[in-house]
Amino acid sequence: QSPIFGPQDVSSIEGNSVSITCYYPDTSVNRHTRKYWCRQGANGYCATLISSNGYLSKEYSGRASLINFPENSTFVINIAHLTQEDTGSYKCGLGTTNRGLFFDVSLEVSQVPEFPNDTHVYTKDIGRTVTIECRFKEGNAHSKKSLCKKRGEACEVVIDSTEYVDPSYKDRAILFMKGTSRDIFYVNISHLIPSDAGLYVCQAGEGPSADKNNADLQVLEPEPELLYKDLRSSVTFECDLGREVANDAKYLCRKNKETCDVIINTLGKRDPAFEGRILLTPRDDNGRFSVLITGLRKEDAGHYQCGAHSSGLPQEGWPVQAWQLFVNEESTIPNSRSVVKGVTGGSVAIVCPYNPKESSSLKYWCHWEADENGRCPVLVGTQALVQEGYEGRLALFDQPGSGAYTVILNQLTTQDSGFYWCLTDGDSRWRTTIELQVAEATKKPDLEVTPQNATAVIGETFTISCHYPCKFYSQEKYWCKWSNDGCHILPSHDEGARQSSVSCDQSSQIVSMTLNPVKKEDEGWYWCGVKEGQVYGETTAIYVAVEERTRGSPHINPTDANARAKDAPEEEAMESSVREDENKANLDPRLFADEREIQNAGDQAQENRASGNAGSAGGQSGSSK
């Protein structure tokens, strides 16, 4: 007997799709070897139609795929647009030739069934409404009208014109006539369920003069759409349930053992397992909505269903749409920290991966909010103004070509705790979710700036010092001036290598920044930070106020004001006359043309991308000593 297992018989109808799962023994060799699907010929030869090596036959072009799921020890063959020519004997198997391990599968594709001429076929989805049309002659205009359902030889009345309704059709079936029509009556059956399917007979009159019509009702269960997503990527379920449920509560549920467990609904219910990584967005007034889930996990794989009902819960006889989500563990999206911890007053540097093939894409960072159906207002972006409340403490540093950008948030408070999303206007799969946890600080911050009340006087020299601990000794220290389009690192150069020191004096590690002479436009936020290459670390921020020298006020000697800096043997100073053209930039409204859940933070449109790139020092000059 073959160790490969799968469906022995698969039957479908023309135009449909099939998804055939083949199971193989869980060994390393099996997980990595070639998987194939071939058609058995009369001569005993099995012709490959598709394989995991990338081969795809001409007859399967554009309509088939083979996907390996090594973590489940399965592979799936999807074939769409079936025709009767697809009927035949097949093998799914493993190995370098088609004679290896295999399982025989019989596929039968039938024509859409035909009925006698007098039978009208009605095809409806679960939860929908069917209107059965019943014609009669004038002689039966005043006779009793009825609709019955065939059960073997018997025909059980569903509804009739004497107002009888079968209990199982109560509140679902109505019999009516339209306008002045004297030769047709109609029966509506709403909230269709699978057991409603079958042959119906409508009748006007009694005995041999009665007019009869046959109706075959087919109630289709939702054909799940197959979705294949990578681990850590995102998925969007687009749900279109029709206008008739436009005003009912919507939900997305995941089929479980006993029930379909609601993940999110429009009444505010949300599964804690999806906290911080789910958004439900109404698309229009016709009942369309979408659910976006980011940071896909292995356990997210499964059967999902969206639906509508006033309770916000799945109900039999209400329209649904279905998906089967597969999560591929062999992901192109790198593993990044899902939880980042910080302390009050401190800072965090969050690394956001993006598709390295799209280095020119616009990068964004948004804050997931739990209210209503979840939303994610953009806080910062490469072409978006920093949102109110984040000025001077939030910046995005793009690192073109590295496949990642860094978002730095400092002056942390406990209110900053929550979920944040990294996203771009490019590949929508590359959306990562980070949970930021901010705890109360129990010790002094690693970086401290003096003086803490920084007021510079126009025309004078102003120096601020940043004290850092020995653990940052080998790291690159920098000062940058914060603006709405990033934090622009102030230029510096080392005048000779610093003397290496075996011991490190905790009190003498200082990096200073000097403004000489101070200009009005020097006012603003400055950051002191540490980094190693492209990896950003701790930062601290200080606001430098600039004022006119008042007549009669003493001229403060900057050397005295920064006496501590003067004595520092390990001092690194930067002197800069900084000119900042604050390019006001705005999030392109086309970015989420169909994803309004991620809100635009900008309020000033600008056609061109901001010219200053975070981390660049273009247009600035200065010296260090």
């Epitope: 297992f5 469906p7 022995q8 698969v10 479908s12 289709l220 479980n256 379909c260 006889g317």
Partner: nanobody, 126 residues
Framework: QVQLVESGGGLVQAGDSLRLSCAAS????????MGWFRQGPGKEREFVAT??????????YYTDSVKGRFTISRDNAKNTVYLQMNSLKPEDTAVYYC?????????????????WGQGTQVTVSS
């Protein structure tokens, strides 16, 4: 909840046929697959056959020992699944259980089935 009721079991001679039925009621709209398992005297419960569906597409799975002899089918309108058993052998003697699943990753695994019937006895004498 889904309720399952089996019928059609009995005592037959080797080589004879039997047709088992499993009628489902309750929240049947949630089901995705239905199958048959059996438990012979002193043995563990084992997979026999399962039918899963997706719209108008059916997938039928069988254990090796019944291939070509047993056929599983379903009547959607009646919410009923059948197991047609031909060329019965004494080793087919067992209690046959009907099972239904809302989510099925591997149809052979017992723990993937959410609902079970009470079972119907099939005895094949030689």
């Amino acid at each position: 909840q889904v309720q399952l009721v089996e019928s059609g079991g009995g005592l037959v001679q080797a080589g004879d046929s039997l047709r088992l039925s499993c009628a489902a009621s309750g929240r049947t709209f949630t089901t995705y697959g239905m199958g048959w398992f059996r438990q012979g005297p002193g043995k563990e419960r084992e997979f026999v056959a399962t039918i899963t569906w997706s719209g108008s597409t059916n997938y039928k799975y069988y254990t090796d020992s019944v291939k070509g002899r047993f056929t599983i089918s379903r009547d959607n309108a009646k919410n009923t699944v059948y197991l047609q058993m031909n060329s019965l052998k004494p080793e087919d003697t067992a209690v046959y259980y009907c099972a239904a699943s809302t989510v099925l990753t591997d149809p052979r695994r017992l723990n993937e089935y959410d609902y079970w019937g009470q079972g119907t006895q099939v005895t094949v004498s030689s």
